[in-house]
C-alpha cells in the first residue's frame, strides 16, 4: 500500500460527548490539516474512510455502519452517533485517500456519563460577564447542524439542578439566556437541554456553560501599589534580615498581563551581586481582581544593602506604577534620599 501522511493523534481535539445523546464529529483533516474542504476532495475522487481503536485496545477496526436504526453513520465529513453509547469511547481515525494519495489523522473521543443534575467529567466552556453590565446573553453552544432550521426544538435552561423559572435577573429566551445587571451570585453552571424530533424519535442535547462574573471595564485601573508606601520605614541593623513586601492590586481586565517586579539601584535582582530571594503569591477577589505580592528578602543585610534603592514596579494594560521602599540603617538618623 502507498505511503500515508499520518498526522498522528490530534490531542488538541479532546472531544467529549454525553452518553445517550446524538453527536456529530467533523473529520479534523479539513479543519486543521489540509488546505481544501471535503467537497473539493470528494469531487477530485478522494474517499473518506473512518475507523477506530476501542479504549484500552491496540487493534484498529472499521466502524460498523450497519447497526440497528443507523446508530452510527457518516454524512460527508461528519461521523454521526444517534445516540452515543459509553463503549463508543476510543480513538477515531479519518483517512482521505485514492490510489495515489493518502492522509489521515486520529483523535480521541470520550463518551461521558452525567447524573440527573448534569454533573459529569465534562469540561465546560467558561463565559465571563461583566458585573453590573446591562445585558449579557449566552447561547446554547454546539447545537448547530443537529436539526434543520425548519425544526423548532424545545429548550429548557437550568442553573445547577434548578430549572430557570422566575429568576429575577435571568431570562430564558429559547436558545439564549439573558442576564440583566449580573452579580457574583449569578456565577455557576448553566445548562441548556435541547429536545428535537428526528425520524419519529426524540433526541436530547445537553450543553453546559460556566458563567463567571468579573470586574467591569469601567472599574479598570492601572496597578495600585499598597506596599511599599511612604508610611513604613524598613529600619535594620547590618546582619539582620530585610524583608520588603511589594503588594499590588490589579483590577480585572480581560486578557491583561499583570506584572510585578523589583529593581535594586535600577537593576533587576538577577543583575546585582546581592543575595536576594523573591517569593511571589497571588490571590483573587470574587470578581477576579488580583492581588499580587512579591516579597524581597535579604537574609543578612549589609550596610551597603541598606543604602540601596529598592523600587517595586507594576504594570498592566492600563498603565504602570512604581514605589520605592524607605530603607535605612538603625540608629543612622537619616533615610537615604530615594531618586526615582
Amino acid at each position: 500500500s502507498e505511503r500515508c501522511d499520518d498526522w498522528g493523534l490530534d490531542t488538541m481535539r479532546q472531544i467529549q460527548v454525553f452518553e445517550d445523546e446524538p453527536a456529530r464529529i467533523k473529520c479534523p483533516l479539513f479543519e486543521h490539516f489540509l488546505k481544501y474542504n471535503y467537497s473539493t476532495a470528494h469531487s477530485s475522487g478522494l474517499t473518506l474512510i473512518w475507523y477506530w481503536t476501542r479504549q484500552d485496545r491496540d487493534l484498529e477496526e472499521p466502524i460498523n455502519f450497519r447497526l440497528p436504526e443507523n446508530r452510527i453513520s457518516k454524512e460527508k465529513d461528519v461521523l454521526w452517533f444517534r445516540p452515543t453509547l459509553l463503549n463508543d469511547t476510543g480513538n477515531y481515525t479519518c483517512m482521505l485517500r485514492n490510489t495515489t494519495y493518502c492522509s489521515k489523522v486520529a483523535f480521541p473521543l470520550e463518551v461521558v456519563q452525567k447524573d440527573s443534575c448534569f454533573n459529569s467529567a465534562m469540561r465546560f466552556p467558561v463565559h465571563k460577564m461583566y458585573i453590573e453590565h446591562g445585558i449579557h446573553k449566552i447561547t446554547c453552544p454546539n447545537v448547530d447542524g443537529y436539526f434543520p432550521s425548519s425544526v423548532k426544538p424545545s429548550v429548557t435552561w437550568y442553573k445547577g439542578c434548578t430549572e430557570i423559572v422566575d429568576f429575577h435577573n435571568v431570562l430564558p429566551e429559547g436558545m439564549n439566556l439573558s442576564f440583566f445587571i449580573p452579580l457574583v451570585s449569578n456565577n455557576g453552571n448553566y445548562t441548556c437541554v435541547v429536545t428535537y424530533p428526528e425520524n419519529g424519535r426524540l433526541f436530547h442535547l445537553t450543553r453546559t456553560v460556566t458563567v463567571k462574573v468579573v470586574g467591569s471595564p469601567k472599574d479598570a485601573l492601572p496597578p495600585q501599589i499598597y506596599s511599599p508606601n511612604d508610611r513604613v520605614v524598613y529600619e535594620k541593623e547590618p546582619g539582620e534580615e530585610l524583608v520588603i513586601p511589594c503588594k499590588v492590586y490589579f483590577s480585572f481586565i480581560m486578557d491583561s498581563h499583570n506584572e510585578v517586579w523589583w529593581t535594586i539601584d535600577g537593576k533587576k535582582p538577577d543583575d546585582v551581586t546581592v543575595d536576594i530571594t523573591i517569593n511571589e503569591s497571588v490571590s483573587y477577589s470574587s470578581t477576579e481582581d488580583e492581588t499580587r505580592t512579591q516579597i524581597l528578602s535579604i537574609k543578612k543585610v549589609t550596610p551597603e544593602d541598606l543604602r540601596r534603592n529598592y523600587v517595586c514596579h507594576a504594570r498592566n494594560t492600563k498603565g504602570e506604577a512604581e514605589q520605592a521602599a524607605k530603607v535605612k540603617q538603625k540608629g543612622n538618623g537619616c533615610t537615604e534620599p530615594m531618586t526615582l
Epitope: 458585573i131 445585558i135 452579580l183 470574587s286
Partner: antibody, heavy 118, light 107 residues
Amino acid sequence: EVQLLESGGGLVQPGGSLRLSCAASGFTLSGFSMSWVRQAPGKGLEWVSAISYDGEGTLYADSVKGRFTISRDNSKNTLYLQMNSLRAEDTAVYYCARFRYYTAFDYWGQGTLVTVSS
Amino acid sequence: EIVMTQSPATLSVSPGERATLSCRASQSVSSNLAWYQQKPGQAPRLLIYGASTRATGIPARFSGSGSGTEFTLTISSLQSEDFAVYYCQQYNNWPWTFGQGTKVEIK
C-alpha cells in the same frame, strides 16, 4: 461633593401617571448603576428598580413590573422613573440611590413624596 | 426573594451603652450585606458595606460582623446622634431586599 436631587413628586389620582427625575452632581452618572428605593409613610425601605451604568439593563420589583419604567440620560446626568397606572399602595417617598456591587447604596437623594389618592 | 429579618424591632439603650442589632437572611448572602441609618425626615445613610467595612466618614464606634445568614451591627458607645432607625440590606441577589428596621431609642 456627590449629590442626588429628586423632583417630580406630588399628588396624583389612582390610575394616573407621574415622572420622577433625579439630577446627579459631583460624579459622572455614566460610571454608576442607579436605583429607585421607596418608603411608604411610617414603613420600611423597598427597592423599586435598577438600571445598569450603560442604561441597557433594567430590573423591577414585582410590585411595579409592567407599570414603572426606569431610564437615564447620561448626557444630562439625570435618572428618571416613569410611573403609570398608579395605585394607592404606591404612595411613598421615592429616593434615588447610586449603587455599586462592592459598596451597595453609597449615596442617596433627599427623596420626593408621591401621594396617590382620589 | 431573600427575606431579611431584623431583631429586635425596638432597642432601648442609654447613651454611652453598647447596642447590638441583629439581621438574619432567609438564605446565604455571603458578605454582601449593608447597614443604613435613617433619622426622621432624612434619607438613609450608608454605615457598613461588605458586612464589616465602614463607609467613608463613619465613626469607629460602628462595626459590622457576620457572613452567610447571620449579621450584627454593633454601636460600642451610643451617642445622642445615634438614636435612629437602622436597616440591613442584602445585595447578593436580585431583588435587593431590606430588613424591616430596628429603632434604637433613648432608654
